[in-house]
Structure formats: structure tokens, C-alpha cells
């Protein structure tokens, strides 16, 4: 689509005569008829296939033509066409005398013609005017002409339609040749694809507008290169989405089991020493003069029962004093004057004489201890349970209650989380310290490979009329790129084209 423009500049008819040589009365009131048609080697009468245009009366005899509207006409004259410019043309310009106001051909006598010129040749589309002058024996016409494309049409033949846009369907302006020139921040054939923030992770990030970086589920940060830990995770981090790798001192699947209660809570008071003894459990070793689970209670020196072998304690200003029962002596009544003859060993302990019978030693049966086998053994004091297991006294024996994920007499064995085949769709299971991880086959994702991904939406050939199909991987949908002349989401509708011309 374009316009053939003809600019009439000057017409000279000094004698004011018609083509027949007869003079006009009182002068030649001159108007022009223009016929534009396809190229003819010899320009002959016939249909003006590219169009016609007439002017009003522009002047009398000889005159210059203003290059704007003149008496309702227009200069330059416009001959629009709705087809591909062929590059060649024929042009007929007739100057006529108008005796009255009716300029219709049928209202004029045939001898009202002043002059007629006919030219033909090639003409490329362009902004530059071609100047021409045609002279006959009695008249001279100076004019210029050019072909330009209509709005939104481009190219050598005005055949490329391009309309700048900045919406969902594209973000571009048009180059002189009709090619698209994407607006800043957009790319792709139709400039529909935003250019994400520089550095935005190719797989984990995407964008819906330029310089944006939005993260896919499980990723975070400016460039979507940091993972998000599992929803239930409490004191852990991740290296891939939804993991929960425990911070130091925490255990369990969601890192919610406190393995370092001493550091996290400092429960022991009055300078006592804290020892971790499993999940959320600890032991305080009190300094002299303190007692209680957390050594929170102050006691007199006798409260710690320093006198052994039944000695009685007496508080004194500078400490305490032990009153020993018969057969014992020493600061804490720790020395015995007894011998094996006095049967000093309790709970079935056997007595052995030492230092030629001056004293003795008791050999205690299992479960008993003390110099006289008077104390029952607490088998849990040595913390025998591994991996945060809880020790329980059970009569003559002990047992370990294990945390989830561990087994064995002493909780020393790690239970395989993979034993129950948790990975779907043929995923490979890997045991980790705090759970498991699935490596998914192609086409599946998710923590357990339960999510099907990357369906080829183009597999069903949804696009018509030789359109190109593209799969949008973010939504598993297709987009059809239509060839020229077709529209619609599947390129199923032909665009209404102009009728063909006979030349």
C-alpha cells in the first residue's frame, strides 16, 4: 500500500489557446486530469489501472501552482494504491479549459483540451522527488513526482506491513525496511520475550518484564541462585531446594532436635559444668556447696554427705566434722578398722584381706559398687547410647531408646530412609545424614520425582498453514508463529488480502 504523489509546479500557455489552436474566451481557465496506469511501452488510452485524480481550476493561461490545498484541490495530488508497487508506471496528464463550473468529462466539449502529456518508466519507492518538464508547441508543464509507502507499510515495494506496538503481542518499532526493531529490554522474533536481569539464573529464574528476575519455586535471592530450605526445617540450611541440612548442634529430619542443649540454653547455674547427654537432655556437675538438677540450690557442706561408712556430719564455722562409727576413722570415716572377720561386704560382695589383715577390700557382684558394695550401679552414667539415644535403667540391665533414623543396641546403626522406595517414576534414592534425596529421571521433578515436567506441547502439531510451533517450557503450552497472511492462536484464519490486478 502506498501513494503516487504528483506535484504540479508551473503551467505556461502564453497565448491562451486550446490544443486545436482556438483561443479560450476570455482566457483558458485551466484544470488537470491525471491518469496513472501500469507500464505500457506505448502509452495508449484505456483504464487508469492505478487510479485517476482531477484538480479544480488552478489558474488561467500561465500560472504557478502553490504546493498546498488550492481551491479545494490538493497539491501534491495523491494517487493511492493498495498493492505491491511494481516499480514501473505510465502517467497521462491532461490540461483542460473549463468554460463553466461543471468539470465533469461529459459536461465539457471535446475541443476543451489544452494539452496532453504521456510518460512512462521505472520509479523506485523513495522520499526524493523526480523533477520533469514537458513542452509542446504551445504549452509547457513543470512538475515532480514520487512514490511513498502508506503509514505502516515498508520496503522497496511497500509490501511489508509493520505497525509499531508496545503490548502483550510485541514491543517494537519499525525499521525503514519494515523489519522489527525491539524496544530496549525485549528480544525474540516479535520482541515478546523480556531480557531478564543480568545474571538471573537461567534455570531457576525467569521474568515477565525487562530487568526482572523472578524465582521458580524453591529458589530465592536477587539472581535466584539461593535455595529455600524445607517448610518444616527449623535450624538448617540447603544446597538444593527443600533440603534441611542441620546447623551445628541440631539433629533430626527437620533439624529441630537440640543436640547441644548446653550451648543453646546454658541451663547449669552457679558455675556448674554442663554435659550434653542426648536430645534436649543434659547433666550439670555442680561445684561444691550446690545441688539440684541445674545446681540452682545452695547447700551446707554437710548436705553433700561427705562422711562415709555411716559417719555423721557436724557443720562447723570453717567446714564440717565427721563423727565416725565404731571400726572407722579418717577425715571422712573412709578408713576401716574392720577386717574380713567382721563381714563388712554387703549385697553378696566377697571380702579380701589386705596388709596382713590390717584392712580389707570388697569385690562386688554385678550391679553393686562402693567400698562395701553398698551402692547400686547406675548403668547409664557412662552415656553408652550413641546418636542422641536415651539410656533407660531396666533392673539388672540397661537399654537405649533411639532417635528416629537410628537403631541397634546402642543406636549405633543408621536406618536407611531409602528402604521404603520413596522415589517415584524410577527416581534414584540417596541416603543423607538427615533424610534422603531423590535423583529424578528426565521429565520428572519434585522432592520425590512426583511432578511430570517438560511436556512437548508441539508434539500434536497444533499449528495450521505451515506455521512454526514453539513450546513454552514455563507453562507447557504452545505458541504458533504464523506465516504472512494468516492469524489466530493456531494460524487458522487467512487475512483478507486485496484482489489481484490484471497487469
Amino acid at each position: 500500500s502506498g501513494v503516487f504523489q504528483l506535484q504540479l509546479q508551473e503551467f505556461i500557455n502564453e497565448r491562451g489557446v486550446l490544443a486545436s489552436g482556438r483561443p479560450c474566451e476570455p482566457g483558458c481557465r485551466t484544470f488537470f486530469r491525471v491518469c496513472l496506469k501500469h507500464f505500457q511501452a506505448v502509452v495508449s488510452p484505456g483504464p487508469c489501472t492505478f487510479g485517476t485524480v482531477s484538480t479544480p481550476v488552478l489558474g488561467t493561461n500561465s500560472f504557478a501552482v502553490r504546493d498546498d490545498s488550492s481551491g479545494g484541490g490538493r497539491n501534491p495530488l495523491q494517487l493511492p494504491f493498495n498493492f505491491t508497487w511494481p516499480g514501473t508506471f505510465s502517467l497521462i496528464i491532461e490540461a483542460w479549459h473549463a468554460p463553466g463550473d461543471d468539470l465533469r468529462p461529459e459536461a465539457l466539449p471535446p475541443d476543451a483540451l489544452i494539452s496532453k502529456i504521456a510518460i512512462q518508466g521505472s520509479l523506485a519507492v523513495g522520499q526524493n522527488w523526480l523533477l520533469d518538464e514537458q513542452t509542446s508547441t504551445l504549452t509547457r508543464l513543470r512538475y515532480s513526482y514520487r512514490v511513498i509507502c502508506s503509514d505502516n507499510y515498508y520496503g522497496d515495494n511497500c509490501s511489508r506491513l509493520c505497525k509499531k506496538r508496545n503490548d502483550h503481542f510485541g514491543h517494537y518499532v519499525c525499521q525503514p525496511d519494515g523489519n522489527l526493531s525491539c524496544l530496549p529490554g525485549w528480544t525474540g522474533e516479535y520482541c515478546q520475550q523480556p531480557i531478564c536481569l543480568s545474571g538471573c539464573h537461567e534455570q531457576n529464574g525467569y521474568c515477565s518484564k525487562p530487568a526482572e528476575c523472578l524465582c521458580r519455586p524453591g529458589w530465592q535471592g536477587r539472581l535466584c541462585n539461593e535455595c529455600i530450605p524445607h517448610n518444616g526445617c527449623r535450624h538448617g540450611t540447603c544446597s538444593t531446594p527443600w533440603q534441611c541440612t542441620c546447623d551445628e548442634g541440631w539433629g533430626g529430619l527437620f533439624c529441630d532436635q537440640d543436640l547441644n542443649y548446653c550451648t543453646h540454653h546454658s541451663p547449669c547455674k552457679n558455675g556448674a559444668t554442663c554435659s550434653n547427654s542426648g536430645q534436649r537432655s543434659y547433666t550439670c556437675t555442680c561445684r561444691p556447696g550446690y545441688t539440684g538438677v541445674d545446681c540452682e540450690l545452695e547447700l551446707s557442706e554437710c548436705d553433700s554427705n561427705p562422711c562415709r561408712n555411716g559417719g555423721s556430719c557436724k557443720d562447723q564455722e570453717d567446714g564440717y566434722h565427721c563423727l565416725c562409727p565404731p571400726g572407722y576413722y579418717g577425715l571422712h570415716c573412709e578408713h576401716s578398722t574392720l577386717s574380713c572377720a567382721d563381714s563388712p561386704c554387703f549385697n553378696g560382695g566377697s571380702c579380701r584381706e589386705r596388709n596382713q589383715g590390717a584392712n580389707y577390700a570388697c569385690e562386688c557382684p554385678p550391679n553393686f559398687t562402693g567400698s562395701n558394695c553398698e551402692k547400686k550401679v547406675d548403668r547409664c552414667t557412662s552415656n553408652p547410647c550413641a546418636n542422641g539415644g536415651q539410656c533407660l535403667n531396666r533392673g539388672p540391665s540397661r537399654m537405649c531408646r533411639c532417635r528416629p533414623g537410628f537403631t541397634g543396641t546402642y543406636c549405633e546403626l543408621h536406618v536407611s530412609d531409602c528402604a521404603r522406595n520413596p522415589c517415584a517414576h524410577g527416581g534414584t534414592c540417596h541416603d543423607l545424614e538427615n533424610g534422603l534425596m531423590c535423583t529424578c529421571p528426565a521429565g520428572f521433578s519434585g522432592r520425590r520425582c512426583e511432578v511430570r515436567t517438560s511436556i512437548d506441547a508441539c508434539a500434536s502439531s497444533p499449528c495450521f498453514n505451515r506455521a512454526t510451533c514453539y513450546t513454552d517450557l514455563s507453562t507447557d503450552t504452545f505458541v504458533c508463529n504464523c506465516p504472512y497472511g494468516f492469524v489466530g492462536s493456531r494460524c487458522e484464519f487467512p487475512v483478507g488480502l486485496p484482489p489481484s490486478f490484471p497487469w
Epitope: C215, W219, Q220, R222, N231, C233, R234, H235, G446, T477
Partner: antibody, heavy 118, light 107 residues
């Protein structure tokens, strides 16, 4: 036990400002992205803003962009929402939540009511 | 923005009933869907994430299913403490969006 406790809500005139705070405990705050979600009286839930855990990247719903600012202080285990140029339509209970815009909101505070009225 | 549409908006049922709430997304959100329970005057509580994974401490009578655009929350046998409002939420596309809610009332 995870705990999120919001404070700072109240009555404010249109065009006014408020700063909401959220104190977090029971989890390693610096490891997790955080968000604010609001609920207008008798209405549904509406995501407001999100902040990532390490680099502090922020995202906002369109209607609050340029007026609200989400921030965090990992040393204080605290999340904040600075609300400026408040409008009547911002009236809601504001919840502090653990989550991002692309993950579930796993834990929620009890909420703090913001009323914008003249 | 992705629109999330829940149905029904409200529902009356009795203790012991099996109840299903549906949620439809305006475009494919894969399995990136969560369900929340909210009781009057309280904060929402996460029930289900990734369409069908139960959050910590949620009773097994709750279950979720679906993928793409259509999802359901099922309570196999209603208990008195289950009467509340339930919301679905998608976190596949930015910004995250919630359904309008389904109020579950005692019959």
C-alpha cells in the same frame, strides 16, 4: 517451638505512616525468607511483600509498591514493614509469615490490626 | 496474576462426614499449591503443600490431590475442630495468590 509475634499496629489517618515489627524465635531466622500477608476485615488473604534470607531481595504486590518497605535484622531475629502514605484500603490484619512468594507460608504470627481511617 | 477460584464458598456438614473442597487455577500451576485452615480470630495454619504433602502435625484425615489447574482438599471424617475457613494458594507464578476461601460450617 516456632513463634512469630507481630506488633506496631493501630489506628492511623489516611496518608499517615506505621512501622510493623515481627519477633521470630524457635528457628534460625537468618536461614529463611520471610513475608507479610494481610487480611482485610471479613475478606480473604492477600500477599503483601517478601524478603529473601541472605541478600535481602524484596518483592511487593503492585498496590503497595513505593509505599511499603519490608526489611529484616538477622542479628535481632526481627522482620519489619514500614508503611507510608496509608490508604483506607490498607486496613487489615497484617500477618508475619515464614515463606517466599514461591513457597508455602509455613508459619504465621497471630497478626496485628492496622486501621486507616479519618 | 493467576486467579484461584474455590468452590463451594460455604459448606454445611456433620461430624463424621467426608468433605471435598475444590480449587481451580486460571492457568497451569503444576503441583505448586498449598491449603490453609483458619479459625475465627486466629492466624491461618499450613495444612498441605505441594498439592498432597501433609505439613508437620496435621492429622492424616486431611489429604490433597490434583495437578495443573484443578485441585481438591479432602477431609475423610470431619471432626469438631475441623469447622473453619479453608484457603488454597498457588506459589508457581509471581505474585502468589489465594483463593477466596471456603467456610465449612456445622450442619
Amino acid at each position: 517451638e516456632v513463634q512469630l509475634v507481630e506488633s506496631g499496629g493501630g489506628l492511623v489517618q489516611p496518608g499517615g505512616s506505621l512501622r510493623l515489627s515481627c519477633a521470630a524465635s524457635g528457628f534460625t531466622f537468618s536461614n529463611f525468607p520471610m513475608a507479610w500477608v494481610r487480611q482485610a476485615p471479613g475478606k480473604g488473604l492477600e500477599w503483601v511483600a517478601t524478603i529473601s534470607s541472605s541478600d535481602g531481595t524484596t518483592y511487593y504486590r503492585d498496590s503497595v509498591k513505593g509505599r511499603f518497605t519490608i526489611s529484616r535484622d538477622n542479628a535481632k531475629n526481627s522482620l519489619y514493614l514500614q508503611m507510608n502514605s496509608l490508604r483506607a484500603e490498607d486496613t487489615a490484619v497484617y500477618y508475619c509469615s515464614r515463606g517466599y512468594y514461591n513457597s508455602p507460608f509455613a508459619y504465621w504470627g497471630q497478626g496485628t490490626l492496622v486501621t486507616v481511617s479519618s | 496474576d493467576i486467579q484461584m477460584t474455590q468452590s463451594p464458598s460455604s459448606l454445611s456438614a456433620s461430624v463424621g462426614d467426608r468433605v471435598t473442597i475444590t480449587c481451580r487455577a486460571s492457568e497451569d500451576i503444576y503441583s505448586n499449591l498449598a491449603w490453609y485452615q483458619q479459625k475465627p480470630g486466629k492466624a491461618p495454619k499450613l495444612l498441605i503443600f505441594d498439592t498432597n504433602n501433609l505439613a508437620d502435625g496435621v492429622p492424616s484425615r486431611f489429604s490433597g490431590s490434583g495437578s495443573g489447574t484443578d485441585f481438591t482438599l479432602t477431609i475423610s471424617s470431619l471432626q469438631p475442630e475441623d469447622f473453619a475457613t479453608y484457603y488454597c494458594q498457588q506459589y508457581n507464578n509471581y505474585p502468589p495468590t489465594f483463593g477466596q476461601g471456603t467456610k465449612l460450617e456445622i450442619k
